[in-house]
């Protein structure tokens, strides 16, 4: 037989299919010019010493073969003895290691069999109603195709699926989308309506991430609040790796996951912007405010679930950094200014109440006054901190209030609102004899004592009603009892107590009269 012809003799090897897992597969045959044809195939397994034979059976039942040697591609003309206008059946037999391996057969009409390309170029992937939609430009002059896909996950073999007939300049396919694992897809095409035409090669892998991007395991911690009123947020994360199918390992465009940090400043709700999204690599400095932080994983289908972390406010308080003066027309706060042109956020909330009940006020950008102080004033009508109770006040500052990560804490302190001097007056003052010349004076704690750092001291005043002589005794804010000694029997005294803050003198309690009875000896 001539090498250019299909040889109508028995092939030079025994006729037996070994049924082994290796062997020839994916046989494709098509016309490549007006009178020339090509068949190509893949060979799975060791290639050393393998000889390939392209077998062909005509509709008459006569069969022939082409010897291809070690090649997996073979060309022949319409004069090679193979009928190109009628249906023929083709397959490959590979002779290796004293055994024959056979490919699946293809039955087609060679003249009408056009070489179809797989989807070429960019395959767009999107999500549509819980499924995967792939879309691509139809290869030139190949409108009208049947399309198949195959897909696999890291732990499952290839599964075949059908995209259905296509008849347009763009082709598309709906495929299954996995929730939690990455998939590799490949697509192939063949001529529509051409009986038994060959499938194209499989396309390059299309790597598709899971619908839910993997959520990293993270840990947050914050450093101590620095002198500048800021604290660094630090992150420890578990290295997470998305397991990829074989064809997606290495460079797998499409399966990338991006991690971002979403920061929500809970304190100072009256500021313009409360939320900011940052790249995970750059950990921000935060003020002493309360924050919620979430790590958001996103892939090409959008964000996944996130785990939210709550960072409580730093409650370290400054004892006397804040000065408050109450006048007839309102109240003014003074504190050491941070810098030129700073916006301040003053936040206050009644102590012991839920953080959600905080109120705040934003100042216009202000420069320090001549004494280097910043101020905030409000009228009595505004009702701000007007109730006679303890408030927790925090002042934040920023030169760029629109930038969430540039706020710093100026100070945190406690303040007793309303008419503190009257509200703080101690009640239930009682006098008990202690000895022949002394008494013990007790009183109920002032309301100011509920406000850490506000009550500076108690003052107990004792007045001798005969001589009108007055003595005053300072008492520690933690004490509610004092012993008055050096008193004379039979003399009437009055005692009063007041509670003082660092900037306000308290109102005296109601005078309490007492005397030490004269002891008559037998």
């Amino acid at each position: 037989c001539r090498t250019s012809e299909c040889c109508f003799q028995d092939p030079p090897y025994p006729d037996a299919d070994s049924g082994s897992a290796s062997g020839p597969r994916d046989l494709r045959c098509y016309r490549i010019s007006s009178d020339r044809y090509e068949c190509s195939w893949q060979y799975e397994g060791p290639t050393a010493g393998v000889s390939h034979f392209l077998r062909c059976c005509l509709s008459s039942g006569r069969c022939c073969y082409f010897a291809a040697g070690s090649a997996t591609r073979l060309q022949f003309s319409d004069q090679a003895g193979v009928s190109v206008l009628y249906t023929v059946t083709l397959w490959v037999e590979s002779w290796a290691r004293n055994q024959t391996e056979k490919s699946p057969e293809v039955t087609l009409q060679l003249y009408n069999s056009v070489k179809y390309e797989p989807p070429l170029g960019d395959i767009k992937v999107s999500k549509l109603a819980g499924q995967l939609r792939m879309e691509w430009e139809t290869p030139d002059n190949q409108v009208g195709a049947e399309v198949q896909f195959r897909h696999r996950t890291p732990s499952s073999p290839w599964k075949l699926g059908d995209c259905g007939p296509q008849d347009d300049d763009t082709e598309s396919c709906l495929c299954p989308l996995e929730m939690n694992v990455a998939q590799e897809f490949q697509l192939r095409r063949r001529q529509l309506g051409s009986q038994g035409s060959s499938w194209s090669k499989w396309s390059s892998p299309v790597c598709v991430p899971p619908e839910n991007p993997p959520q990293p395991q993270v840990r947050f911690s914050v450093e101590q609040l620095g002198q500048d009123g800021r604290r660094r947020l630090t992150l420890k994360e578990q290295p997470t790796q998305l397991e990829l199918p074989e064809g997606c390992q290495g460079l797998a465009p499409g399966t990338e996951v991006t991690y971002r940090l979403q920061l929500h400043m809970l304190s100072c709700p009256c500021k313009a912007k409360a939320t900011r999204t940052l790249h995970l690599g750059k950990m921000p400095y935060l003020s002493g405010a309360a924050y919620n932080v979430a790590v958001i994983s996103s892939n090409q289908f959008g964000p996944g679930l996130n785990q939210t972390w709550h960072i409580p406010a730093d409650t370290h308080t400054e004892p006397v950094a804040l000065n408050i003066s109450v006048g007839t027309n309102g109240t003014t706060m003074y504190w050491p200014a941070r810098a030129q042109s700073m916006t301040y956020c003053i936040e206050w909330q009644p102590v012991g109440q839920d953080g959600g009940l905080a109120t705040c006020s934003l100042t216009a950008p202000q420069d320090p006054d001549p004494a280097g102080m910043a101020t905030y004033s409000w009228s009595r009508e505004s009702g701000a901190m007007g109730q006679e109770k303890c408030y927790y006040i925090t002042i934040f500052a920023s030169a760029h209030p629109e930038k969430l990560t540039l706020w710093s804490t100026v100070l945190s302190t406690y303040h007793f609102g309303g008419n503190a001097s009257a509200a703080g007056t101690p009640h239930h003052v009682s006098v008990k004899n202690h000895s022949l010349d002394s008494v013990s004076v007790d009183w109920a704690p002032s309301l100011l004592s509920t406000c850490p750092g506000v009550l500076k001291e108690y003052v107990v005043r004792c007045r001798d009603e005969d001589s009108k002589q007055v003595s005053e005794h300072p008492v520690q804010p933690t004490e509610t009892q004092v012993t008055l000694s050096g008193l004379r029997a039979g003399v009437a005294y009055t005692v009063q107590v007041r509670a003082d803050t660092a900037w306000l003198r308290g109102v005296w309690s109601q005078p309490q009269r007492f005397s030490i009875e004269v002891q008559v000896s037998d």
Epitope: V181, Q215, S221, Q238, T240, H310
Partner: antibody, heavy 117, light 107 residues
Framework: QVQLVQSGAEVKKPGASVKVSCKTS????????IHWVRQAPGQGLEWMGI????????SYAQQFQGRVTMTRDTSTSTVYMELSSLRSEDTAVYYC??????????WGRGTLVTVSS | EIVLTQSPGTLSLSPGERATLSCRAS???????LAWYQQKPGQAPRLLIY???SRATGIPDRFSGSGSGTDFTLTISRLEPEDFAVYYC????????FGQGTKLEIK
Amino acid sequence: QVQLVQSGAEVKKPGASVKVSCKTSGYTFTSYYIHWVRQAPGQGLEWMGIINPSGGITSYAQQFQGRVTMTRDTSTSTVYMELSSLRSEDTAVYYCAREGDWYFDLWGRGTLVTVSS
Amino acid sequence: EIVLTQSPGTLSLSPGERATLSCRASQSVSSSYLAWYQQKPGQAPRLLIYGASSRATGIPDRFSGSGSGTDFTLTISRLEPEDFAVYYCQQYGSSYTFGQGTKLEIK
């Protein structure tokens, strides 16, 4: 020695709150995260949330969001877990557990919380 | 969330025998972030294995862990009377989930 000591058993009515404590000793309190895990009678283990004792930073499992609060007191090296709006399904043994390197290397003995009307 | 399924639910063996407990994850457990715990009645769980195969401090070498991806195994080479308990696997690669447990009982 290194240990986590939990508060005693509690009986609560539906709708009430319970606060369980976990006192740590034998190691630096602020160096290890503490988790809370619960186990209903005859059931498996369910993760509730985590607290960083250093800054009080917390994160809770989705199903407990809004009902659980974890706090700490650095002066006594104690972590607290408060669960509100209790229902009968919350009857369980509540464990605190110390995190080693992401896994739980040390557990408290558990606190039985019974919710019954 | 990652669901862990342990099998068998109950395993009846005699002291001296070999026990093989299985834990299968609904999706791949990142970097073998899998631990095994032992729990005896009325006691807290105790860490046996972390990182799928590393033994915790003080755990006898008859306990060993293996596996990766979605399939993990705890093996007790020669059962001692004190080994009869409930065993839980736990993944800590994405939040935290536990298996439903395998009860190892004396035959």
